[in-house]
């Protein structure tokens, strides 16, 4: 929808546009309006883009008006909330960003003979993207000075320049995502796809035997199984197999038999021949040991001359028994052969915590900072390491020690510095904590060490011209004198700033008052209302251009008047036999400078820009992906990060291209499985999976990779008449009418007589792009005044 | 006030096809999506299969994937189910859905607002 | 195919109130405020009575009100009336089901 808010009014004398007071009468002294304001309201046409306004025509885009909301002057600004201010346009159809605005204010008659009259109108074209933000506009011309701000909002849920791109955020089957700010899907967590409506399994799940509907799930295939159901199952019963596919059981090597459960290679699984006899195999779970001499039994286990190999370590003696041998080991050892080291500590001998390191026969203990001796049973003496640091000195105590701490210090080891600071600043002051004291440091205006001295800053008399001096907290503060003003009132009031004279007079400064010169033409206090000079003085034509009037405002007692036939964009010269020729202001051109010169002659818009004439200058509407006063800088569309799972962007005109990595496909690498999705090809346009990347056919009036660009093809032929200029607008197009001319297609005449340009009953005769006013018997001039 | 109107049920031998149709009107049909939900004699409602509002999206159930097509005519206001290779457990009463939309913590979710009065499919030799 | 559970049947007299339960899992009605009510009268449309487990379509008499605890959704019919005999059944939205909602498997009411 389009917002407009009216901000404020300053309509200082009560006036109509066409001279008039709303309430009626003048007062004869002041040329005052007097009796009752204008019961101002405002009326709002909102149309497409034209560089010359024209009044009429339809409001394309829509029209609305306020309810009277204020007198002659009001001010809005702060009123937040108040409805009665605002217009609200909605539109159904795509925004085009540029457009036309006609404000205008008027007057209420309050009844329904007499007709509302116009105050002032204001009229704005330009181009407006969607935004919370207001963009305020001064009416700064005529009778009345108005001032309004107007914003272009989406509604929810749509977005994009245009308020054409839908994005409704989801949480349910059919889709799991949020909006972006550029109506972009992003999937919640563990979702993917165009529509975020698969779930993405857990990391690793096979995606031929695994699947899932919920994230992080992996639910396997029958036959498969695992976490990553990226295991077959084997044949149940299967003891020494596997499978390379669900329900096989192929054997490991040296197994044999359908379950793979019989051992072909016995002597090499068991080993079951000891005292380095041979072993051979005779059949499944089957082997034979061959032993060597003094060796006997199944396993070669009984030892015919046991001692002869001296089993015993660590200087253990041996003794042949009937079984084999027996160890007698030597002190700290025990076990068959004399291996083990026996564990002297246990049970733990250390005193005091202390930890217990076995040795052989015998232990060490490591004992904590506080204890020493063979199991921690003495107190040590920790002041021999210095541990005090700011104290007059160190005492050993069993077990501690303690640190007689300097004044200010605190702690163990007397290295914390105690905090003098216990709030005996005042007035806000800082403290700062010092070893054994502290500092106040004073907020401005305040002294003492504890800040508690207001500083009297009128001591010094600052006052001047008799001003009498109050003293405040860190600042004075001067009462002047009437006749003084300023901080030190050492200024005399200067009753002409800012100036209140109008239209150029002078202004004088008095003691009390001030004084206006007014220029001839005006007259009043503040030189605001304009003299009639008819009342006093006749005319004379001079020539073609000029007439004299009789004046006490110059030397000669004449004045001239420069006659306005040029229009406002010219100057009048006149030429012998009663002719005239028009001296043109820049920019225009024609008999009357009524002709806006064509700026746009040049082609100045760049890279497909279209451009739309101004006065003296011109202005380029781009195509779609480049900005720029000539359209010369391609938009960058990766500066909202859009390749995801670390695809890399690259800027196109108006697009962008994703190179995607690690298998991620589509737009914007976000898919597993497809190049395509509903938002691959803008437009209409439909997509083709092409294996590792995608082409999108576009319809009628779109191009590009994405069928992002639109074809010049709405404007050609160029549908705007008489002089118009074409603005592709997707797949239809805006005309920017010349002067002139109006209508959607620039085939209406502009009324030039509206509103009323001639005076006095003079008929108004309409041409293009001009006016003459044919005036009533008596009357003369280009408007019959 | 919104109408839904199913058609095209009937009596079908087994492997035949059949093609349902629901005219909808009383509301923007184009801007939502629709459904076809199922109840056989007996038991309770299945949801059958359903598509977005522009029909570019379609989503079935898996008992009936492969056979069955949902379609949609925004021109015409018009829903369609093409029911091929039909089995006896396909008989039910089929009901025509209008998906609304609410809001929960920021985020929307659909939900069967309108129904049609149904129509009876029965497939048996 | 159904897998929210209702009672069959469910009976009052004129006036007073009636109460019918929906129990599910934590996956659909425990675990997401998706829940919707709806009566049938046999050769008729369905109609929404209740959605978002507690709101009420705008004609809907405010009779009929729905809450939630746990697993279960509840449907209570206040001063129940005869033009209140019809099937209701309950539906919701599970994360790990196939289908975008699934319903409850009905509860035939009576007004004795």
């Known amino acids: 929808q389009f917002e407009l808010e009216i901000l404020s009014m300053q309509n200082v004398n009560g006036e109509l546009q066409n001279g008039n007071c709303c309430g009626g009468a003048r007062n004869p002294g002041d040329r005052k309006c007097t009796r009752d304001e204008c019961d101002t309201y405002f009326k709002v046409c909102l149309k497409e883009y034209q560089s010359r306004v024209t009044a009429g025509g339809p409001c394309s885009f829509g029209s609305g008006s306020t309810p009277v909301i204020g007198g002659n002057t009001f001010n809005l600004k702060a009123s937040r909330g108040n409805d009665r201010n605002r217009i609200v346009l909605p539109f159904s159809f795509a925004w085009p960003r540029s457009y036309t605005l006609l404000v205008e204010a008027w007057d209420s008659s309050n009844d329904t003979v007499q007709p509302d009259s116009i105050i002032e109108k204001a009229s704005h074209s330009g181009m407006i993207n969607p935004s919370r933000q207001w963009q305020t506009l001064k009416q700064n011309t005529g009778v009345a000075h108005f001032e309004y701000q107007i914003r272009v909002t989406c509604d929810d849920y749509y977005y994009g320049f245009g308020c054409n791109k839908f994005c409704r955020p989801r949480d349910d089957f059919f889709g799991h995502y949020a909006c972006d700010q550029n109506g972009n899907k992003t999937c919640m967590e563990g979702w993917m796809g165009p529509e975020c409506n698969r779930a993405i399994c857990r990391q690793g799940c096979s995606p031929k035997h695994g699947s899932c509907k919920l994230p992080g799930d992996c639910r396997c295939q029958y036959g498969w199984q695992g976490l990553y159901c990226d295991k077959c199952i084997p044949h149940p019963g299967c003891v020494h197999g596997i499978c390379n596919e669900p329900w096989q059981c192929l054997c490991e090597t040296n197994w044999g038999g359908q379950l793979c459960d019989k051992d072909l290679n016995y002597c090499g699984t068991h080993q079951p021949c000891l005292n380095g006899g041979t072993c051979s195999n005779t059949g499944p779970d089957k082997y034979q040991c061959s032993c060597p001499e003094g060796y006997s039994g199944p396993n070669c286990e009984i030892a015919e001359h046991a001692c002869l190999s001296d089993p015993c370590h660590n200087r253990g003696s041996c003794k042949e028994t009937s079984l084999g041998f027996e160890c007698e080991c030597s002190p700290g050892w025990t076990g068959p052969t004399c291996s083990t080291n026996i564990d002297d500590c246990s049970p733990n001998n250390c005193s005091h915590g202390g930890t217990c390191q076995d040795l052989v026969n015998g232990f060490k203990c490591v004992c904590p900072p506080q204890w020493t001796g063979k199991t921690c049973q003495l107190d040590a003496n920790e002041c021999e390491a210095k541990p005090c640091v700011n104290a007059k000195s160190c005492k050993n105590l069993i077990a501690s020690y303690y640190c007689d701490c300097l004044p200010g210090w605190m702690g163990q080891n007397c290295d914390i510095n105690i905090n003098d600071c216990l709030g005996q600043c005042q007035n806000d002051a800082s403290c700062r904590d010092l070893v054994n004291g502290y500092r106040c440091i004073c907020p401005p205006g305040y002294a003492g060490d504890h800040c508690e001295r207001d500083i009297d800053e009128c001591a010094s008399n600052p006052c001047l011209n008799g001003g009498h001096c109050q003293n405040e907290i860190n600042r004075f503060q001067c009462l002047c004198p009437t006749g003084f003003s300023g901080n030190l009132c050492q200024l005399d009031i200067d009753y002409c700033e800012p100036n209140p004279c109008q239209n150029g007079a002078q202004c004088y400064n008095r003691a009390s008052d001030y004084f206006c010169k007014c220029p001839e033409d005006y007259e009043g206090k503040n030189c605001s209302h304009l003299k009639d000079h008819c009342r006093t003085t006749p005319c004379e034509v001079i020539d073609s251009c000029t007439v004299a009037m009789a004046s006490n405002d110059t030397p000669e007692g004449v004045r001239y008047i420069s006659s306005n036939v040029c229009g406002p964009h010219g100057k009048c010269k006149s030429q012998s036999g009663g002719k005239f020729t028009c001296d043109c202001n820049k920019g225009f051109t024609g008999t009357y400078c009524h002709e806006n010169i064509n700026d746009c002659e040049s082609n100045p818009c760049r890279n497909g820009g279209t451009c739309i004439d101004g006065v003296n200058s011109y202005k380029c509407i781009c195509s779609d992906g480049w900005e720029g006063a000539y359209c010369e800088t391609n938009i960058n569309d990766c500066s909202q990060n859009p390749c995801h799972n670390g695809g890399t962007c690259r800027d196109l005109v108006n697009d962008f291209y994703c190179d995607c990595k690690n298998g991620w496909k589509g737009k914007t690498c976000h898919s597993r499985d497809s190049q395509c999705d509903e938002a691959t090809c803008n437009n209409g346009g439909t997509c083709y999976d092409e294996g590792d990347a995608f082409k999108c056919m576009c319809p009628g009036g779109w191009e590009g990779t994405t069928c992002n660009i639109a074809r010049n093809s709405s404007c050609l032929p160029n549908p705007c008449h008489n002089g118009g200029t074409c603005v592709v607008n997707g797949e239809s197009f805006t005309c920017v009418c010349k002067e002139g001319w109006e209508g959607p297609i620039c085939a209406q005449n502009t009324n030039d007589c509206s509103p009323h340009p001639c005076y006095n009953s003079g008929t108004c005769v309409d041409g293009d792009n001009w006016y003459r006013c044919e005036c009533a018997p008596g009357f003369a001039g280009p408007d019959c005044r | 006030q919104v109408q839904l109107v199913e058609s095209g049920g009937g009596l079908v031998q087994p492997g035949g096809s059949l093609r349902l149709s629901c005219a909808a009107s009383?509301?923007?049909?184009?801007?939502?999506?629709m459904s076809w939900v199922r109840q056989a004699p007996g038991k309770g409602l299945e949801w059958v299969s359903a598509?977005?509002?522009?029909?570019?999206?379609?989503y079935y159930a898996d008992s009936v994937k492969g056979r069955f097509t949902i379609s949609r005519d925004n021109s015409k206001n018009t829903l369609y189910l093409q029911m091929n290779s039909l089995r006896a457990e396909d008989t039910a009463v089929y009901y025509c859905?209008?998906?609304?939309?609410?809001?929960?913590?920021?985020?929307?979710?659909?939900?069967?607002?309108?129904w049609g009065q149904g129509t009876l499919v029965t497939v048996s030799s | 195919q159904s897998v929210l559970t209702q009672p069959p049947s469910a009976s009052g007299s004129p006036g007073q109130s009636l109460a019918i339960s929906c129990t599910g899992t934590?996956?659909?009605?425990?675990?997401?405020?998706?829940v919707s009510w709806y009566q049938h009268h046999p050769g008729k449309a369905p109609k929404l009575i209740i959605y978002?487990?507690?709101k009420r379509p705008s004609g809907v008499p405010d009779r009929f009100s729905g809450s939630k605890s746990g697993n279960t959704a509840s449907l209570t019919i206040s001063g129940l009336q005869a033009e209140d005999e019809a099937d209701y059944f309950c539906?919701?939205?599970?994360?790990?089901?196939?289908?975008?909602?699934?319903f409850g498997t009905g509860t035939k009411v009576t007004v004795l």
């Open positions: 859905a209008k998906e609304d939309l609410a809001m929960r913590r920021g985020y929307s979710y659909g939900y069967p607002g309108y």
């Open positions: 009383g509301f923007t049909f184009s801007s939502y999506a």
């Open positions: 598509i977005s509002g522009s029909g570019g999206s379609t």
């Open positions: 934590s996956s659909d009605v425990g675990g997401y405020n998706y």
């Open positions: 978002d487990v507690n």
């Open positions: 539906s919701s939205y599970a994360v790990n089901n196939n289908s975008p909602y699934f």
